[in-house]
């Protein structure tokens, strides 16, 4: 496994990219003046206690910003949050940190990111533009859970 985070560019099937706005990740159409975030992706070192065949458990961070994606409950509902955390601090832990972990599954060119802490909940964007990234259980038309990854550098 890689010991350095892999920088990637992520967009959904509607060619919307991830942008950081007021400490929230939103998906917006790719335009000249849009500055997409670069996502850092690194595999978890400890998979013994994680489910097998569900995907590659990874941490997702915002490149150079010391922010990582995590899942936590707000009331009864799991929510997607950005937390100040160094992705390498997560990688170097002696235990998996499930709240920051996602099962990365690839089918052809499409990738999905399922929360390890909340199985069945996926990173998604609303089919409408300019919406925050969310966690959803509904894999239908209202939300897009399929993303395309482009390796950078």
């Amino acid at each position: 496994k890689s010991e350095m985070p892999q920088p990637v560019s992520i967009q959904d099937i509607n060619h919307r990219v991830w942008v950081l706005q007021d400490q929230i990740l939103i998906a917006v159409p790719r335009k000249d003046r849009v500055s997409p975030v670069t996502i850092s992706l690194i595999s978890c070192r400890h998979v013994e206690t994680l489910e097998k065949d569900r995907g590659n458990p990874i941490y997702l961070g915002l490149n150079g910003l010391n922010l990582c994606l995590m899942c936590a409950k707000a009331g009864d509902q799991p929510t997607l949050q950005l937390k100040e955390k160094d992705i390498m601090d997560l990688y170097n832990q002696p235990e998996p940190v499930k709240s920051f972990l996602f099962y990365h599954s690839q089918s052809g060119r499409n990738s999905t990111f399922e929360s390890v802490a909340f199985p069945g909940w996926f990173i998604a964007v609303s089919s409408e533009g300019g919406c925050p990234l969310i966690l959803t259980q509904e894999l239908g038309k209202a939300n897009t859970t399929d993303f395309g990854l482009t390796m950078l550098f």
Epitope: E48, D89, P94, E95, S99
Partner: antibody, heavy 121, light 111 residues
Framework: QLQLQESGPGLVKPSETLSLTCTVS??????????WGWIRQPPGKGLEWIGS???????YYNPSLKSRVTISVDTSKNQFSLKLSSVTAADTAVYYC?????????????WGQGTLVTVSS | QSVLTQPPSVSGAPGQRVTISCTGS?????????VHWYQQLPGTAPKLLIY???NRPSGVPDRFSGSKSGTSASLAITGLQAEDEADYYC???????????FGGGTKLTVL
Amino acid sequence: QLQLQESGPGLVKPSETLSLTCTVSGGSIGSRSYYWGWIRQPPGKGLEWIGSIHYSGTTYYNPSLKSRVTISVDTSKNQFSLKLSSVTAADTAVYYCARVAPSYPRVFDYWGQGTLVTVSS
Amino acid sequence: QSVLTQPPSVSGAPGQRVTISCTGSSSNIGAGYDVHWYQQLPGTAPKLLIYGNRNRPSGVPDRFSGSKSGTSASLAITGLQAEDEADYYCQSYDYSLRVYVFGGGTKLTVL
């Protein structure tokens, strides 16, 4: 039945290095699933994790002790060792070695009997 | 001060039921990490009593049971016996501190 046995000096002078070895019998230290750890207990106090090692050499240390701790493994002797440098009276404790088994988080499922190390001049 | 908080002592008469609590935070028990329990009889090494919140290793009587909810866990002992007199420690992991953490220990006295 897996057994762990700590060995090493019972008395160490301040500023010197504490060295202990744990010998494992009844099982192989080279098992992929397990780490091997050191935990200490000052007299009359609670337990403190010092660090853990895998047979491959991967180590994890308690950040509060990291600058002074080295844990190593010798698979040929079925042993792992602890070195703690620049000791003070605060390092006086019973030192236990233990097997660290897969769980979430990992669990210390087999323990040695412990060895008391006193730091004194 | 321990990261996981336990009552310093509990007591009960033979045959009674006692519980020992273990309270953590959002970076350990509340982050989804399980809780393990150890029994330390006087003058001996700790022995694994409960792992993964509620599982007993073989040889541990079913008088001992564990549970977890939110940021805390508890150990229950029913049908208290004189030989249960010991120190009990909970253990988990804290991802903010990057350490395996133990409670401060609870001394159980059988009256």
